[in-house]
Interface confidence: low
């Protein structure tokens, strides 16, 4: 019994589960004797293209009687006056009905498959009686908002007499305009009466910005007596039939608006009809834009003829509805605005895959954006552009798949054809707050596949740790480290050299666990890039990064400069990122600048080597990163601290030296091999690098549309890391406290200072 009830319910409610993807005109209006053409849209899947299409009339009791179908059936009511044509390549079919009568008025469905299965769209057809016109009536049919010119002939005897135009309101004619200068208030500012030259026995009345209320019967008259000349006119003002637009969810739509040269210099707008007659401005040429369309709309520049187009990307369900474009000095719909109309249907059975609409990154970090494209167009050129809201919105190109990269983005932006098969990847690193905004993915092929992604810059620090800009020496070997936290343990780590067509993979060495992450276990990694026999061609940007298969995650960039060997005292490693933007929080200032002192002398970093070479201290050559001495890597007996320097000086120098060294957490030391030097870099500032957690973009973010790669949620980590247990962040000590602690440490060790200083630096 229950089964029977369920079966009945399914029969009665065939389409309650999903919204039908079939779409057509909700209302069709025509006049007796005329023809109509009704277009119905369907998702052009293989099954839909080949299935039966039908047009049926809904009965009072809910059934739907087929009148015509794609399988050749034509009802006797339609014989000889109707046809149905399928256009499978467009996903449309068209029903043409001629010789309409008022009997054709009613409720219909256009649909696919079986009449009762719900894959259909309801259409209301209204056939009205033609106007009962007086003899000799001239009919003017004009679109809403346009201009009409009513011509009124007269005879010579009335040439000098008053000319007038009346409108029939009910039984009475109401004066609209006359040649003595009268203008009816309803027509003020939009009507004029022109009397042609004496040779032509004709006067004209021109009405602009036609309103629906202007429709009706008019009478023009020359003279006021029984000899006057009269002419009847019937003005029909047409509300524009909306053009049906059927687009996929997440896709893109373009409204082409051609209102004519007469409004070329008038402000243009696109609005969306809400309840009643209200039409909310979506965008206009006066700079207004609805917040719901921020980042995903462009009003393309007008042509000389006043035509323009509006592009909307990232279509949402709520974007469906009726849109009007028009021209009016206020930049919004007013009575008498010339308009064009569209009915937008957003197909939820979209062919466009879900992709993150928001991607998050941290200052100094990176994002990897996945962009869908029509897989049938794998050879199309892929583009990425930055949406700008100024004026009417524009989207300047940043990168394309043919190797063009905007100059300001060189070294930090790459468009990769991977993973392919309908998706390409854009990687942007060295992020700053200025990179926040909306970006569009598009191709030179299917314009419906334009998608929008918003990049947000959030609090936190990058996951990958690399030195700043590095200087290599011609002919020698360069080793550049990249530190990967343990959260990336299961991902492929790589180094590559950036160029404008991508990033060419390079061999790299896994050098075991990294000491850069104090709260990380053995799964962290230090992966080094080694360049042997450096040449000029090695100069450029290098990226280290993580990926899984063809899906890319975080990247970090290092610029390698190449210079010739210099004499002693020359530059060792350039670790200060000179070209960082002012607000660029690249890693941490402690690492980018190494506190301007942290690599004063490698010996300071040996566990207990607290005293520096007095000669070096004396001649002030330790003021900056770049001025390290290259003469004495092995340390030397010249540091005769115990015998040549008074103990007070030893204590003072030691306190400063150890203050710097200890403040950098001596144990967290890593080594970069550059030239013949050994430069030890404190990595202490790298702990808790994701205090506020940034999105790693390996897949997507934990935002509006979440996806993750291979189910590995730790790659997303928008707000916290799921694989690391973080130590509570230590409060930063003041420099005074650091100095005091260092001094205490130094006193405890002072008994061994002299001997160890003479032994030279040992490895940390």
């Amino acid at each position: 019994m229950l089964l029977f009830v369920l079966t009945c319910l399914l029969a009665v409610f065939p389409a309650i589960s999903t919204k039908s993807p079939i779409f057509g005109p909700e209302e069709v209006n025509s006049v007796e004797g005329n023809s109509v053409s009704i277009t119905c849209y369907y998702p052009p899947t293989s099954v839909n293209r080949h299935t039966r299409k039908y047009w049926c009339r809904q009965g009072a009791r809910g059934g739907c009687i087929t009148l015509i179908s794609s399988e050749g059936y034509v009802s006797s009511k339609y014989a000889g006056r109707a046809n149905l044509t399928n256009f499978p390549e467009n996903g449309t079919f068209v029903v043409n009905i001629a010789q309409l009568s008022q009997d054709d008025s009613g409720r219909y469905k256009c649909g696919l498959g079986i009449n009762s299965r719900g894959l259909s769209f309801d259409v209301s057809l209204e056939v009205s009686q033609g106007p009962g016109l007086l003899n000799d009536t001239k009919v003017y049919t004009v679109d809403l908002g346009r201009t009409v010119t009513i011509n009124c002939p007269f005879k010579t005897e009335n040439a000098q007499k008053r000319k007038s135009l009346y409108k029939q309101i009910g039984l009475y004619p109401v004066l609209v305009i006359d040649s003595s200068g009268y203008v009816n208030p309803n027509y003020t500012g939009r009507i004029r009466l022109d009397i042609q030259g004496t040779g032509q026995l004709l006067f004209s009345v021109v009405i602009n910005q036609l309103r629906l209320s202007d429709a009706g019967q008019y009478l023009c008259q020359a003279g006021d007596d029984s000899n006057s000349n009269k002419k009847n006119a019937d003005l029909q003002v047409l509300k524009p039939e909306p053009e049906l637009v059927y687009e996929d969810l997440r896709g893109s739509v373009t409204f082409h608006c051609a209102l004519g040269p007469e409004v070329a210099n008038v402000a243009k707008f696109l609005c969306r009809q809400s309840s009643g007659e209200n039409c909310d401005v979506v965008v206009n040429t006066l700079g207004k834009r609805a917040p719901a369309f921020e980042g995903r709309i462009l009003l393309n520049p007008q042509d000389k003829d006043g035509s323009f187009s509006v592009v909307i990307t990232g279509l949402r369900k709520e974007d469906a509805g009726r849109y009007l474009c028009g021209a009016h000095s206020d930049g919004q719909l007013q009575e008498g605005s010339p308009i064009q109309a569209w009915q937008l249907f957003v197909n939820e059975e979209s062919t466009i895959p879900r992709s993150p609409t928001v991607v998050k990154g941290v200052a100094g970090g990176s994002v990897a954006v996945l962009c869908p494209y029509n897989r049938k167009e794998s050879k199309s050129i892929k583009y990425w552009c930055l949406w700008e809201g100024a004026q009417n919105g524009r989207c300047p190109l940043l990168v394309d798949s043919e190797g063009w990269v905007k100059a300001q983005y060189e070294g930090r932006l790459s468009l990769l054809e991977e993973p392919g098969n309908g998706t390409f990847t854009v990687i942007l690193n060295q992020l700053t707050s200025r990179d926040a905004g909306f970006y569009w993915c598009l191709t030179n092929g299917d314009t419906l596949w334009r998608t929008t992604v918003e990049i947000k810059i959030i609090e936190g620090e990058p996951n990958l740790k690399v030195p700043g800009n590095v200087t290599a020496v011609l002919g020698e070997t360069l080793k550049v480290p990249c530190h990967f936290p343990c959260k990336f343990s299961s991902y492929e780590k790589y180094w590559c050299k950036w160029n404008n067509t991508g990033c060419q993979a390079l061999p790299s060495q896994d050098e075991g666990p990294s000491k850069a992450f104090v709260n990380c276990d053995e799964n962290s990694r230090l992966v080094s890039l080694t360049l042997n026999l450096v040449t000029r061609a090695d100069e450029g940007w290098y990226w280290c990064g993580v990926k899984q298969g063809h899906f890319y995650g975080e990247t970090a960039a290092v610029y390698v400069a190449v210079e010739e060997r210099k004499a002693a005292g020359s530059r060792d490693v350039s670790l200060a990122k000179a070209d960082a933007a002012p607000d660029e929080k690249v890693l941490d200032s402690g690492f980018r600048e190494i506190e301007n002192k942290a690599i004063q002398d490698p010996r300071l970093f040996a566990e207990e080597k607290a005293v520096a070479d007095t000669r070096d201290q004396a001649d002030g050559s330790r003021a900056s990163v770049d001025s390290g001495s290259s003469e004495e890597q092995g340390g030397s007996s010249r540091a005769l601290v115990s015998t040549l320097v008074p103990l007070g000086l030893v204590l003072a120098v030691g306190a400063v030296a150890v203050g710097v060294a200890r403040a950098r957490h001596r144990k967290n030391v890593d080594r970069v091999s550059i030239r013949s030097y050994r430069t030890d870099i404190s990595m202490s500032d790298f702990e808790n690098s994701r205090e506020f957690g940034a999105n790693d973009n390996m897949g997507a973010s934990s935002i509006t549309q979440e996806t993750s790669l291979g189910g590995k949620e730790e790659f997303v980590a928008t707000t916290e890391s799921t694989t690391e247990t973080k130590e509570p962040k230590k409060a930063k000590r003041s420099s005074k406290e650091e100095a005091e602690m260092a001094y205490k440490d130094f006193l405890l060790q002072s008994s061994t200072v002299a001997a160890e200083a003479q032994d030279g630096p040992q490895e940390a």
Epitope: T254, L298, N300, P301, V311, I381, Y383, R394, C395, L397, W404, A407, W440, L442, N444, T447, R450
Partner: nanobody, 119 residues
């Protein structure tokens, strides 16, 4: 609309030189990229060289160092100087102009000019 008129194709010996020219007319002011593509026997149309509105030039790997693309001051004519020609360079060369409309690109093509390199 943009109209493209190509000239300068012809026959050359391997190792020789040819210069192709392409003049744009119509709404040429909006052109973002101008360049050359070629269709060699049995292959689909492939990129050769192009110059962007900011004067950045790109070349296909196969022609780098042999071909040079330049543009007149008014930016409406591009010339492709082809040196050290190889038989593999034989094909129909098409001039291309691309306009970035702010939301998509529109490509315009010339009729094509034949280049034949004999060994």
């Amino acid at each position: 609309q943009v109209q493209l008129v190509e000239s300068g194709g012809g026959l050359a010996q391997a190792g020789g030189s040819l210069t192709l020219s392409c003049a744009a007319s119509g709404t040429a002011a909006g052109i973002d990229v101008m360049g050359w593509y070629r269709q060699t026997p049995g292959n689909s149309r492939e990129f050769v060289a192009r110059i962007f509105s900011n004067d950045v030039t790109h070349y296909a790997d196969s022609v780098t160092g042999r071909f040079t693309l330049s543009r007149t001051q008014d930016k409406n004519t591009v010339s492709l100087q082809m040196n050290s020609l190889k038989p593999d360079d034989t094909g129909v060369y098409y001039c291309n102009a691309r306009i970035w409309t702010g939301s998509t690109t529109v490509d315009y093509w010339g009729q094509g000019t034949q280049v034949t390199v004999s060994s």
